[in-house]
């Protein structure tokens, strides 16, 4: 029986019964978030031989081995992967061994086995026999091999039953558990699979087979499965499906994607039955199951039944994802939102043509319209009262329309209207008139020169910083006192600052007017003494952190066309001083001889500067009697040693130690300091771990169905 499309077993271990009759899971298998430790011994699914996508195990309490659950799982095809992985075993608290002793092939993707505190028998499995490439495997944070004492069958009795292979220059026995060897086929079979009796399978078999050289006796197929036979390609009038089997036209014509609420149906393209036409192709008509190439970017026409589509949230914008032509009018009314500009670009960034009008009103969350990054034509087939096809009203934070140096937008019919956009300079509007070809269409009142740009520094002088002083969590800055033509019109200054690891921020960064990542603002009153330069103490800052700072003058002065003449500084980058680091992380100690301890730790999460050395303290403690009671010949886990905590100081310099020639009487060498490349690799590794964990959590924690 083919089960699917993807099976998610969570919360209740009894859901495992869903796997009872499955021989192939067409899709993924998730077993996760079972927090109550259960006895899984009564659950056994010997019929399951193939998973076409991936297997994910996460936080299943009480499960000690997968061998009893899936004794015959032979192939994980990896047709779709979980973050590049076909097998993920993550935070399985009680898992002692993987035990999938019949797993012979992972066709695509790597494995990730991480943070399984009790998991052993990892170094005894030769993954190169199962996967084509092992370089992308990620096996970290499991039980240390030294604490495992992994023994393959027969080793204790000195009658080893398993075969040996070499991994990392270590020639050793290969097994899954204390009583299950890793199966290897005779070298005469080459890349072919073999039976339990070491007879070579048919070349089209994958993993194993029940009879030699027979394409109907395969456990799984190397290429495709059709009508009980493994075939190298799908026969005529059948089509590849889900990467492993052949289906007929009738099957493909009647299936729908479960991931969509539409009923668009699958298509046949290039001999495959697939959910949608591939990139660069479009369906050949509404009733067609076939794809034809697009001329240029594939058009997607979207139509609003009520003629006007109101975009007032990310959710409403989502409906326009992938649309290139919008038949109707766009009314944009974004008052608030999180990360709104990039979300809107994601969903509306492909729109090239709007057949009606575009109206942007009360969109206080918008700083720019650049999220419509491909808009090139507004046809104006339908216009607002007064013959307007581009209407911009009361957008309190709108400062930029588009980057006109890189934008070609045409408004075919209709006029433009701008009013009550206090931060939008009129020069920006005039530039749009020129680019869009609407110059001369607007009447005098259509572009209001009084209330557009009234709160923007549209003609700015430059403020210069005069001094900067830093401490570990403070910055003091002063700047030249700005002297406008009429000194009474200088009201105050506003200082903007934010963390800036790189010197690449701009004034508009993070300004969707609601965003949590926008600039911090501090108002600075004028010093009463006209000769004193204005300044500010920024406090509560982080040590050893680069900040970007700029200052704006708040003025009343008007020039002849009713615009503020303002002043602002360039962006200044300044770093706070170093401070005491936070405590080192993950301190571990182990003994490698009768007179030595090796102590390891990770750097502090907040170094607050460039670390120069660590201080290590230790003290002698009485021997723990428990150590004498433990039988070290048993295969149970060895007790974890207590970590050292000490009193005697050692100063370990982390800067490059003096290089000395090793050997002779000199004694052991110091470990070479890490190169920049190694440090960078470690940093990337830590980042990658976080990204994967976030991906995992975001993928599996879903709202409870209604």
């Amino acid at each position: 029986e083919i089960c699917g499309p993807g099976i998610d077993i969570r919360n209740d271990y009894q859901q495992l019964k869903r796997l009872e009759n499955c021989t192939v899971i067409e899709g993924y298998l998730h077993i996760l978030l079972i927090s109550k430790a259960e006895d899984y011994r009564s659950y056994r699914f010997p019929k399951l031989t193939v998973i076409t996508e991936y297997l994910l195990l996460f936080r299943v309490a009480g499960l000690e081995s997968l061998g009893d659950l899936f004794p015959n799982l032979t192939v994980i095809r990896g047709w779709k992967l979980f973050y590049n992985y076909a097998l993920v075993i993550f935070e399985m608290t009680n898992l002692k061994d993987i035990g999938l002793y019949n797993l012979r092939n992972i066709t695509r993707g790597a494995i990730r086995i991480e943070k399984n505190a009790d998991l052993c028998y990892l170094s005894t499995v030769d993954w190169s026999l199962i996967l084509d490439a092992v370089s992308n495997n990620y096996i970290v944070g499991n039980k240390p091999p030294k604490e495992c004492g992994d023994l393959c069958p027969g080793t204790m009795e000195e009658k080893p039953m398993c075969e040996k292979t070499t991994i990392n220059n270590e020639y050793n026995y290969r097994c899954w558990t204390t009583n299950r060897c890793q199966k290897m086929c005779p070298s005469t079979c080459g890349k072919r699979a073999c039976t339990e009796n070491n007879e070579c399978c048919h070349p089209e078999c994958l993993g194993s087979c029940s009879a030699p050289d027979n394409d109907t006796a395969c456990v799984a197929c190397r290429h495709y499965y059709y009508a009980g036979v493994c075939v190298p390609a799908c026969p005529p009038n059948t089509y590849r499906f889900e990467g492993w089997r052949c289906v007929d036209r009738d099957f493909c014509a009647n299936i729908l994607s479960a991931e969509s609420s539409d009923s668009e149906g699958f298509v046949i393209h290039d001999g495959e039955c697939m959910q949608e036409c591939p990139s660069g192709f479009i369906r050949n008509g509404s009733q067609s199951m076939y794809c034809i190439p697009c001329e240029g970017p594939c058009p997607k026409v979207c139509e609003e039944e009520k003629k006007t589509k109101t975009i007032d949230s990310v959710t409403s914008a989502q409906m326009l994802q992938g649309c290139t032509i919008f038949k109707g009018n766009l009314l944009i009314n974004i008052r608030r939102g999180n990360n709104i500009a990039s979300e809107l670009e994601n969903f509306m960034g492909l729109i090239e043509v709007v057949t009606g009008y575009v109206k942007i009103r009360h969109s206080h969350a918008l700083v720019s319209l650049s999220f419509l990054k491909n808009l090139r034509l507004i046809l104006g087939e339908e216009q607002l009262e007064g013959n307007y096809s581009f209407y911009v009203l009361d957008n309190q934070n709108l400062q930029q329309l588009w980057d006109w140096d890189h934008r070609n937008l045409t408004i075919k019919a209709g006029k433009m209207y701008f009013a009550f956009n206090p931060k939008l300079c009129v020069s920006e509007i005039y530039r749009m008139e020129e680019v869009t070809g609407t110059k001369g269409r607007q009447s005098k009142g259509d572009i209001n020169t009084r209330n557009n740009g009234e709160r923007a520094s549209c003609e700015s002088d430059v403020l210069h910083f005069t001094s900067t002083t830093t401490s570990k969590n403070r910055i003091i800055i002063t700047w030249h006192r700005y002297r406008p033509p009429d000194y009474r019109d200088l009201i105050s200054f506003t200082v903007y600052y934010k963390e800036a690891p790189f010197k690449n921020v701009t004034e508009y960064d993070g300004q969707d007017a609601c965003g949590s990542n926008s600039w911090n603002m501090v108002d600075v009153d004028l010093p009463p003494n006209k000769d004193v330069e204005p300044g500010i103490l920024l406090h509560g800052l982080k040590p050893w952190t680069q900040y970007a700072v700029y200052v704006k003058a708040v003025t009343l002065t008007m020039v002849e066309n009713d615009h503020i003449r303002g002043a602002k500084s360039e962006i200044l980058y300044i770093r706070t001083n170093a401070s005491v680091p936070s405590i080192p992380l993950d301190v571990l100690s182990a003994s490698n001889s009768s007179s030595q301890l090796i102590v390891k730790w990770n750097p502090p999460s907040l170094p607050n500067g460039n670390l120069s050395y660590y201080i290590v303290r230790w003290q002698r403690q009485p021997q723990d009697g428990y150590l004498y009671r433990h039988n070290y010949c048993s295969k149970d886990k060895i007790p974890i040693r207590k970590y050292a905590d000490g009193t005697i100081d050692i100063e370990e310099v982390t800067e490059n130690p003096k290089t000395e020639v090793c050997g002779g009487e000199k004694g052991p060498c110091c470990a070479c300091p890490k190169t920049e490349a190694e440090k960078q690799a470690e940093k990337e590794e830590a980042e990658y771990r976080k990204v994967f964990e976030n991906f995992l959590h975001n993928s599996i924690f879903v709202p409870r169905p209604e």
């Epitope: 699917g4 499309p5 993807g6 998610d8 067409e26 899709g27 993924y28 009647n254 299936i255 729908l256 994607s257 479960a258 991931e259 969509s260 609420s261 539409d262 009923s263 668009e264 149906g265 699958f266 959910q275 369906r283 509404s286 009733q287 139509e303 039944e305 409906m319």
Partner: nanobody, 128 residues
């Protein structure tokens, strides 16, 4: 709240015609695939016909191909089923259903699990 109200059922002679309507409210009608199902007394519910939202692609059960036509009017939020050449075996309660997202993978258009909202049904009786 999504509501689906079927109408147009009734008694008709074999060979006759009927037009069923399904008025939908509480959803953005133009973005959802829709279908007609039917359930004859003592039998399982079966798919009759389905239609997509974006392109209007249609699907029919073999037993009704050439006799029934599904259509939709997005401006009126209404789904239709034109039934011609009716037979006694078409007697059933006809239900209107709206697609819903149902996790990963695929399903056949006539699988009830792919549909998240259902109407109360309208009875069609074909008898002489």
């Amino acid at each position: 709240e999504v509501q689906l109200v079927e109408s147009g059922g009734g008694l008709v002679q074999p060979g006759g015609s009927l037009r069923l309507s399904c008025a939908a409210s509480g959803l953005t009608f133009g973005t959802f695939g829709m279908a007609w199902f039917r359930q004859a007394p003592g039998k399982e519910r079966e798919g009759v016909s389905a239609i997509s939202a974006s392109s209007g692609r249609t699907y029919y059960a073999d037993s009704v191909k050439g006799r029934f036509t599904i259509s939709r009017d997005n401006s009126k939020n209404t789904l239709y089923l034109q039934m011609n050449s009716l037979r006694a075996e078409d007697t059933a309660v006809y239900y209107c259903a709206v697609r819903s997202k149902n996790g990963a993978g695929y399903g056949f258009w006539y699988e009830a699990r792919l549909y998240g909202y259902w109407g109360q049904g309208t009875l069609v009786t074909v008898s002489s």
